[in-house]
């Protein structure tokens, strides 16, 4: 079969796979005037790694509330075996009623774009329900994912959210949009309205043209004990012991307190919906008691008094105090002051000395002034905000909140890179890659001090040296490494870098880059002498930057041969100079010879090497570059990509015909490819470049 | 106390219309569906249909339907059933009930309507 | 439609005797969003308009005598007054409030032996 350069650059020509793992074909390429001899192409095929998700994919939240993914809801697997670290989720679209988060992230940021099957596993990865303004009974959200594992096809996922006043919530203990208990004064009457009461929800179960037929049923099944319940100014009892939503929503439900003293009071009601004229429905139904707390005509409420944040580092506990929590209440005593916690933060949790290490949601002032109130920071180092309801227990709640800052316990400067110096700039801006402080997380708040200066250059912020500087300069480019003195090629810092409250130092260290075009090509014949020129080594770009003569200094190598300076007489090999130094008019004169040698002590071979060498010109820092290249046997049939001044001398013997030897120091036609075929054209130009002379 | 009070009786020739009133106290008119029942002499009890006087809307019973209409006047409290194409066996006692959650709590006193040429 | 059908159609029952009548309808009554069955009893005595005595099929209304019950579930039902009464002597009919048409039975005539 025949295939053109231009069907393979156009991506026309497949591979398909049967059979064996390993394997490939055998081709010939030909110009249409030459022929190469054989090659043969080697294909390794992999095991195709298939993706599968198995686990519900639906996941039932209470109303407002947060809940974990688990492996119940979402759970991928490979055919291979995959790491759940190396399984990860790509959010193509969001939740549309609430949001997705990562619990060990602040909940205020941004939504969640990535996460991986171990944080599934972990409980990690948070849906949070927000709720509307409108009542609904069952509401219904979507996520769309993606999973991928490369080398794996991806697989999309949908995630259904089931939002449910349905579920039994325990941190909702209510089935109705709203049942929040009353407030009256002693001896007096209050109205209960849809704002303490409302079954409304029930009601949105019903589709809404026909919503305005349908009301809520609501049967009182124990009476309060303490005062009565009136409707329309008609009181309930045993024998008519019903009243709808219509007539809470219209205001027509009353409580009146009978007097004699401020104990508690209320009643439970079974509720449920109601179709046209009070015809059976099928729909939702609950049974709940209706809170009426009675409070005493003189008292006075509580007043909250300012609070301080709570500041600790992450994994520790501290005692909540006063300056966090504390009320001016003058007819309660501490232990009247009821707290309840009515929103926790993800980054820890309320304990009480004595009361078991779990959470607590309710506590008192007493507590928190005997200090046996504490908070365990077993979360993020976010900061995290407490929402609770204060109340003495003769007023209404009051909401207060307590804003907890965890801070980290260690911080780490992270330097993926040392910083790289343009030679011919002689300055580069600092980023992410030299100097990022983490914690559990990113720190982008994060601040630097200079504690040690660079020996041969300056620090620069808006072109001014400086020696404090913060993480946003650094992600805006705005430092700078700029070298005063052209004498080196490294240089290093060291800075102190601080995020929220904790330091860390760390050395960033400075290289200069060479301005400097290597080319190594192919292997090199062992045991030949080949010609160094701009092919190989350019620094012509510097010569220009610079306007000066770039020089070169053999630092290091190489281990099998040598730098040698080309006679420009016709002499013997004996006549070549080992060279230490040159310069770019050397590379340019092609005066400059390197002599491959072979590896010493062990079998003929592919082998490989490399050169170092010191970059100087006028003007800029030096730069240290290297040249590595790969050796291998002379081989008389093989096209080299470099200029050869000699050939191995068995293999002059080998030839056996004088005209087939070649004369040190004059290339032969067919010792070389003066040109070094650069692939530039995929890969057809590859097997051009290396298969054809 | 809930009172539900009807317009007085009424002859009527065969293929006559007739619109019985039902005046409510006692209570909140808006709050609770108003039902007409009717009884031919020495038969039981047959319901036509209700009205909701908060929302004006209305169920009829099949039988009547495109024959019945009820109506109501928030303003006096008053709901209305109207019968058209009056045939004798069309002759019974009206009742208008209220009825409370599931049941007819209350009903007014009846009103007779007679069909005959 | 629901169709409600009460037997006997009359009843003779001696004073201070039980007097026992039954409703049967055609589809059950028992709504399954708050377990409760839809069926109520009227008494109707002459030139006078129905009254209620037991809706949801058990509970009495506020001040009817406690002589009279109602029973059962589903599609059959009771009414049962324990002793009977001069003043008990009326036509009692079922019906049911599950869906309408609110259909009633055709009644049972209840008198003295």
């Known amino acids: 079969r025949t295939r053109s350069g231009s069907q393979l650059d156009g991506g026309l020509v497949l591979f398909s796979h049967r059979g064996t793992l390993d394997g490939g074909f055998r081709f010939r390429l030909s110009d249409g005037e030459h022929t190469s001899p054989g090659h043969f192409f080697r294909v390794t095929a992999q095991k195709q790694v298939l993706l599968s998700l198995k686990g519900s994919q639906t996941l039932t939240v209470c109303p407002g509330s947060v809940q974990p993914l688990s492996s119940q809801t979402l759970r991928a697997s490979s055919s291979a075996g995959t790491d759940p670290q190396l399984l990860l989720y790509r959010v193509v679209r969001g939740p549309q009623l609430g949001r997705l988060f990562h619990a060990q992230q602040d909940s205020t940021g941004e939504a969640l774009v990535n996460f991986t099957q171990a944080e599934v596993y972990a409980g990690n990865i948070l849906y949070e329900h927000e709720m509307p303004p409108e009542p609904f009974w069952e509401a219904h959200d979507t996520l769309e994912l993606q999973l991928s594992s490369p080398p794996a096809r991806d697989v999309a996922a949908t995630l259904a959210v089931a939002v449910s006043f349905e579920a039994a919530c325990p941190q909702r203990p209510s089935h109705l949009w709203k049942n929040k208990g009353l407030w009256v004064p002693e001896g007096q009457r209050a109205r209960i309205t849809v704002a303490a009461l409302d079954a409304s929800n029930l009601l949105a179960s019903v589709p809404s043209p026909q919503r305005s037929e349908h009301d809520v049923l609501f049967q009182v099944t124990q009476f309060p004990s303490r005062g009565q319940l009136l409707v329309s100014e008609e009181p309930l009892h045993a024998g008519q012991p019903h009243f709808l939503q219509s007539q809470l929503a219209a205001g027509q439900l009353v409580y009146a307190h009978g007097g004699g003293g401020t104990q508690q009071d209320g009643f439970h009601f079974r509720a449920h919906l109601q179709g046209p004229a009070g015809a059976s429905v099928a729909g939702p139904q609950t049974s709940e008691a209706f809170a009426i707390t009675v409070r005493d005509v003189n008292e006075r409420p509580p007043q909250p008094q300012a609070s301080v944040p709570l500041r600790l580092t992450r994994g520790s506990r501290a005692p909540i105090s006063r300056a966090q929590l504390s009320v001016v209440d003058p007819d309660s005593a501490p232990g009247e002051i009821e707290y309840e916690v009515q929103r926790a933060p993800h980054n820890g949790f309320l304990s009480l000395v004595g009361g078991g290490l779990g959470p607590v949601t309710r506590f008192t002032q007493a507590d928190v002034d005997s200090g046996r109130l504490a908070f365990v920071a077993n979360g993020s180092s976010v900061a995290g905000i407490f929402q609770l309801s204060m109340s003495d227990g003769a007023s209404p709640p009051l909401p207060m909140s307590l804003a907890v800052d965890i801070l980290p316990s260690a911080i780490e400067v992270q330097l993926r890179a040392p910083l790289e110096v343009p030679q011919a700039l002689g300055r580069s801006s600092l980023s992410q890659q030299q100097l990022r402080v983490v914690s559990d997380r990113e720190e982008p708040e994060a601040a630097y001090r200079l504690i040690q200066g660079p020996q041969y250059g300056h620090l620069l912020v808006g072109g001014r040296p400086t020696s404090a500087f913060s993480q946003f300069q650094i992600d805006q480019g705005e430092v700078v490494f700029a070298f005063t003195n052209s004498s080196s090629s490294h240089d290093h810092f060291r800075v102190l870098a601080l995020a929220r409250g904790v330091n860390a130092s760390a050395v960033v260290n400075v290289t200069v880059r060479a301005l400097l075009h290597v080319w190594a090509g192919g292997p090199w014949p062992q045991g030949a002498t080949l010609r160094l020129d701009p092919t190989v080594l350019d620094a012509g770009e510097l010569a220009n930057r610079t306007d000066s003569v770039p020089r070169f200094r053999l630092l290091e190598g190489p281990r099998h041969g040598r730098v040698v300076r080309v006679p420009r007489a016709r002499t013997e090999p004996g006549g070549s100079q080992l060279v230490e130094q040159f310069t770019q008019q050397d590379l340019e004169d092609g005066r400059l010879g390197l002599e491959v040698g072979r590896p010493e002590g062990r079998a003929p071979g592919p082998a490989g090497d490399s050169l170092t060498l010191e970059l100087w010109a006028q003007g800029v820092p030096p730069a240290v570059a290297s040249l590595d290249f790969a050796t291998e046997p002379y081989n008389a049939a093989r096209p080299y990509s470099v200029a050869l001044l000699s050939v191995p001398e068995a293999a002059r013997t080998e030839a056996g015909k004088p005209e087939s030897s070649t004369p040190t120091g004059e290339p032969g036609p067919m010792a070389s490819s003066p040109e070094p075929a650069v692939a530039k054209g995929g890969f057809l130009s590859f097997l051009e470049a290396n298969m054809f002379s | 106390q809930v009172q539900l009070v009807q317009s007085g009786a009424e002859v009527k020739r065969p293929g006559a219309s007739m619109k019985v009133s039902c005046k409510a106290s006692g209570y909140t008119f808006t709050n609770y569906y108003i039902h007409w029942v009717r009884q031919a002499p020495g038969q039981g009890l047959e319901w036509m249909g209700w009205i909701n006087p908060n929302s004006g809307a209305t169920n009829y019973a099949q039988k009547f339907q495109g024959r019945v209409t009820m109506t109501r006047d928030t303003s006096t409290s008053t709901v209305y059933m109207e019968l058209s194409s009056l045939r004798s066996e069309d002759t019974a006692v009206y009742y208008c009930?209220?009825?409370?959650?599931?049941?007819?709590?209350?009903w007014g006193q009846g009103t007779l309507v007679t069909v005959s040429s | 439609d629901i169709v409600m059908t009460q037997s006997p159609d009359s009843l003779a029952v001696s004073l201070g005797e039980r007097a026992t009548i039954n409703c049967k309808s055609s589809q059950s009554v028992l709504s399954s969003s708050n377990n409760k069955n839809y069926l109520n009893w009227y008494q109707q005595k002459p030139g006078q308009p129905p009254k209620l005595l037991i809706y949801?099929?058990?509970t009495r209304e506020s001040g009817v005598p406690d002589r009279f019950s109602g029973s059962g579930s589903g599609t059959d039902f009771t009414l049962t007054i324990s002793s009977l009464q001069a003043e008990d002597v009326a036509v009692y009919y079922c019906?049911?409030?599950?869906?309408?048409?609110?259909?009633f039975g055709q009644g049972t005539k209840l008198e003295i032996k």
């Open positions: 019906q049911q409030h599950f869906n309408t048409p609110f259909a």
């Open positions: 949801w099929a058990s």
């Open positions: 009930a209220k009825s409370w959650v599931s049941w007819f709590a209350s």
